[in-house]
């Protein structure tokens, strides 16, 4: 009787099982009665992930220096090229197929995560003690001055934008 | 016990024809494709036709395609190969050979087929 | 067409040694590779199919292994029964080819 469902790795057509492509080779023909599924290797700048019965390799993927991309994985016969983008820039999407510029923390707010290649800079306002006074995609928030420690007084309060300034202590006459 | 019985060979001119068949027994004949592979006197093994189960299917390598024609009739139990435009270099022992998972798994004891003037 | 070249052509041993024929296939084939061995006056007979997978009533004297474009059949200990052509056969892809074969001969 002719087989209804097939064994993992293989595919029905013409009422028979035949072998699936390994990863890295499309299909040329189909298996016979007598012959096994006949399968080619993706040319240079192809691939295919999966066990398949695809006539057509897929193309690996154009990291676009005008889109801010460069290579980070280079693709074989079985894998996709990985894209990431250059130094400053990270992914507008899992599929990194363009970047934008990574996002800068304006004063007030500090670097909670410095961006990487896929994720933008993480910001956090600079809480009670803290300041930024930049705008910066590296930058913390930095601690007040303290004052005290230099044997001096707080002469104008800080904020999250400014630091405190400091002034020598009033002298007893 | 599976069986398979070529006749049909015999002595033919150049130009000339033959039909071959190969009766089969001993296994359900409308499920196997089957194969005709043919040996000169001391040579080895040429493969000369196949066709499948259904009978739908038929291959030929290029040196007998157009001359050689394969067929089965699966209510007869029956394969036949039909060869026209005989060569000297036809002259061989064609047997016929069921396909068992695209092996050649059961073979005939094959029929003679010599061509001289 | 992919062609199969055996080696050696002849092979002369004695009953009880082991023998080793080669079949070489001009591209891979994967382990798409049947074994056969042929008396005189005889029909050929099915050995090992799929390079390697034994077959119901054939002697576990007889091995076989390999992939891609090299492939191996051995009989651990010779019998005098063995003494025969061996043809390998691909069907990777058509046209079907076989070997020239190798005949193993008693020494």
């Known amino acids: 009787e002719p087989p209804t469902a097939c064994r993992e790795k293989q595919y029905l057509i013409n009422s028979q099982c035949c072998s699936l492509c390994q990863p890295g080779q499309k299909l040329v023909s189909d298996c016979t009665e007598f012959t096994e599924t006949e399968c080619l290797p993706c040319g240079e700048s192809e691939f295919l992930d999966t066990w398949n019965r695809e006539t057509h390799c897929h193309q690996h993927k154009y990291c676009d220096p005008n889109l801010g991309l460069r290579v980070q994985q280079k693709g074989t016969s079985e894998t996709d090229t990985i894209c990431t983008c250059e130094e400053g820039w990270h992914c507008t999407s899992e599929a990194c197929e363009s970047c934008v510029l990574h996002r800068s923390c304006s004063p007030g707010f500090g670097v909670k995560q410095i961006a990487t290649g896929v994720s933008d800079t993480i910001c956090e306002p600079c809480p009670v003690g803290f300041f930024s006074n930049v705008s910066s995609a590296f930058e913390k928030c930095h601690p007040w001055t303290s004052c005290e420690t230099k044997d001096l007084v707080v002469q104008q309060a800080g904020t999250n934008k400014t630091d405190v300034v400091c002034g020598p202590q009033d002298r007893l006459r | 016990e599976v069986q398979l019985v070529e006749s049909g060979g015999g002595l033919v001119k150049p130009g000339g024809s033959l039909r071959l068949s190969c009766a089969a027994s001993?296994?359900?004949?409308?499920?196997?494709?089957i194969s005709w592979v043919r040996q000169a006197p001391g040579k080895g093994l040429e493969w000369v036709s196949s066709?499948?189960?259904?009978?739908?299917?038929?291959y030929y390598p290029d040196n007998v395609k157009g001359r050689f024609t394969i067929s089965r009739d699966n209510a007869k139990n029956s394969l036949y190969l039909q060869m026209n435009s005989l060569r000297a270099e036809d002259t061989a022992v064609y047997y016929c050979?069921?396909?068992?998972?695209?092996?050649?798994?059961?073979w005939g004891q094959g029929t003679l087929v010599t061509v001289s003037s | 067409e992919i062609v199969l070249t055996q080696s050696p052509a002849t092979l002369s041993l004695s009953p009880g040694e082991r023998a080793t024929l080669s079949c070489r296939a001009s591209?891979?084939?994967?382990?798409?590779l049947h074994w056969y061995q042929q008396k005189p006056g005889q029909a050929p007979r099915l050995l090992i199919k799929?390079?390697?997978q034994s077959i119901s009533g054939i002697p576990a004297r007889f091995s076989g292994s390999g992939s891609g474009t090299d492939f191996t059949l051995t009989i651990s200990s010779l019998e005098p029964e063995d003494f025969a052509v061996y043809f390998c056969?691909?069907?990777?892809?058509?046209?079907?080819?076989f070997g020239g074969g190798t005949k193993v001969e008693i020494k």
């Open positions: 056969q691909q069907f990777s892809s058509w046209p079907l080819t």
């Open positions: 591209q891979t084939i994967n382990n798409n």
């Open positions: 799929y390079a390697s």
């Open positions: 066709i499948s189960s259904g009978g739908d299917n038929t």
């Open positions: 050979a069921r396909a068992g998972e695209k092996a050649m798994d059961y």
């Open positions: 001993g296994f359900t004949f409308s499920n196997y494709g």
